[in-house]
């Protein structure tokens, strides 16, 4: 009779987790069993992030460490049965954990918007129009972001309307805009689970035009028209 | 980036075998197991079998048991995979993947006519 | 063998439609499902793996769901690239298997 290897139940695992676990909490477990009814031990291999750890004898798994999932998902470690006593045959299978997003990255503007203006005078009421996004995994839909301004100050003068999930559109109320930059804070709310915001701050000039950009004496560069 | 590629298209006699190769490269080879699946015309996908190549352990399907063998050259990141006494229902689009939930990154696949 | 039965098998529909195919599994699976989809003369594709779980690169308008026996794939509204086969395939103990597929064609 030749002393065959432990046998997983399964051909992987799989378990999934919220990535705001708390330290210690079972997150999955393995199992396998010997032909020859011996006792079985488990460990992991390959756990290059330090996150988790298993009961040698029950094969539970739980969490050493935070999780993150920009991380990497899932997290996959390799589990290792080996029987006791006997021969000491060991076999390999693989334990996936998926780690679900937590809303935990605020919405932030998705590019560089800095050369935002308008030729001053405006001959009518102007407006621009800019787009969010965050850093979390929006598994089911894109993200759906509402806007608004970010101090009442700014109410006299600024609109704000959301177009869609992730772009709105800046008007200006009137045109009696001096020739400076203003700083106009938009708030944006991810609508997540804990909802996060952002504020953040879109610098608008209002400058004397020559052919569509502003003017600028020699050595400046000219802006770019979002109007 | 991740890259599976295999072997060019072979024609077969029934009765001989055919050894189809798949490279593998853009990551640690040992470090995912690689299965080996088939479509033959007009058929839904076959599962075969799998190699993990940093043990060299392999499971094969009991209907192909007899008459496939996976192998693993860590040297050059390839895996084999052989079958014998080929028949004509053995034609089919012989595909590599890699493991890990479901399949991430197939080969192209490598045709197999049997044919006298 | 647990056998996976995959249902239409073939799906007519047009752009901007939303589609629902089904998959069921002989036992429990306890959502170890991934769905594919696969063009003439291309690699399968993997779409979501665990049922639910979107893999990455792959647009949200595709989605998963179901648990135990029974699976669904939803795409949202169709886009013209999504013409295609779509396969469903279980990885709980071996023999992996796969669903026979679902053709989706253009109405």
């Known amino acids: 009779d030749v002393n065959e290897a432990p046998q997983f139940s399964q051909h992987v695992f799989q378990a999934k987790v919220s990535e705001d676990v708390a330290i210690g909490t079972k997150v999955g477990n393995v199992t396998a069993k010997d032909p020859e009814g011996l006792d079985i031990s488990y460990s992991l291999r390959g756990d290059t992030r330090g996150w988790l750890k298993i009961d040698h004898v029950t094969g539970e798994i739980f969490s050493v460490a935070p999780l993150d999932r920009e991380a990497g998902s899932p997290y996959r470690v390799q589990v290792v049965a080996t029987e006791v006593g006997g021969s000491s045959l060991s076999s390999v299978s693989e334990f996936h954990l998926i780690l679900m997003d937590v809303n935990d990255n605020p919405p932030r503007l998705a590019k560089d918007y800095t050369g935002l203006f308008f030729c001053h005078p405006l001959s009518a009421p102007g407006s621009l129009i800019f787009e969010a996004t965050d850093d979390d995994q929006h598994l089911f839909r894109g993200p759906h972001f509402t806007f608004s301004l970010g101090s009442g100050s700014l109410q006299n003068d600024w609109e704000v309307s959301k177009i869609n999930g992730t772009h709105a559109r800046l008007s200006t109320r009137h045109t009696e805009f001096e020739e400076r930059e203003y700083v106009v804070l938009i708030r944006i709310n991810d609508g997540g689970r804990p909802p996060l915001e952002g504020i953040v701050s879109l610098p608008v000039t209002f400058c004397s035009c020559v052919e569509g950009s502003c003017f600028r004496p020699a050595g400046h560069k000219h802006h770019h028209h979002h109007h | 980036q991740v890259q599976l590629v295999q072997s060019g298209a072979e024609v077969k006699k029934p009765g001989a075998s055919v050894k189809v190769s798949c490279k593998a490269s853009?990551?640690?080879?040992?470090?995912?197991?690689m299965h080996w699946m088939r479509q033959a015309p007009g058929q839904g996908q076959e599962w075969m079998g799998y190699?993990?190549?940093?043990?060299?352990?392999?499971e094969y399907n009991q209907k192909f048991k007899d008459r496939v063998t996976m192998t693993a050259d860590k040297s050059t990141s390839t895996v084999y995979m052989e079958l014998s006494s080929l028949r004509s229902e053995d034609t089919a689009v012989y595909y590599c993947?890699?493991?890990?939930?479901?399949?991430?990154?197939w080969g192209q696949g490598t045709l197999v006519t049997v044919s006298s | 063998d647990i056998q996976m039965t995959q249902s239409p098998s073939s799906l007519s529909a047009s752009v901007g439609d939303r589609v629902t195919i089904t998959c069921r599994a002989s036992?429990?699976?306890?959502?170890?499902l991934a769905w594919y989809q696969h063009k003439p003369g291309k690699a399968p594709k993997l779409l979501l793996y665990?049922?639910?779980v979107l893999e990455s690169g792959v647009p949200s308008r595709f989605s998963g769901s179901g648990s135990g026996t029974d699976y669904t794939l939803t795409i949202s509204s169709l886009q013209p690239e999504d013409f295609a086969r779509y396969y469903c395939q279980h990885y709980y103990r071996t023999p992996l298997t796969f669903g026979q597929g679902t053709k989706l064609e253009i109405k």
């Open positions: 036992e429990n699976i306890d959502s170890y």
């Open positions: 853009g990551y640690s080879f040992s470090s995912y197991w």
């Open positions: 665990a049922a639910t």
């Open positions: 190699i993990n190549p940093s043990t060299d352990y392999t």
């Open positions: 993947a890699r493991s890990r939930l479901g399949f991430d990154y």
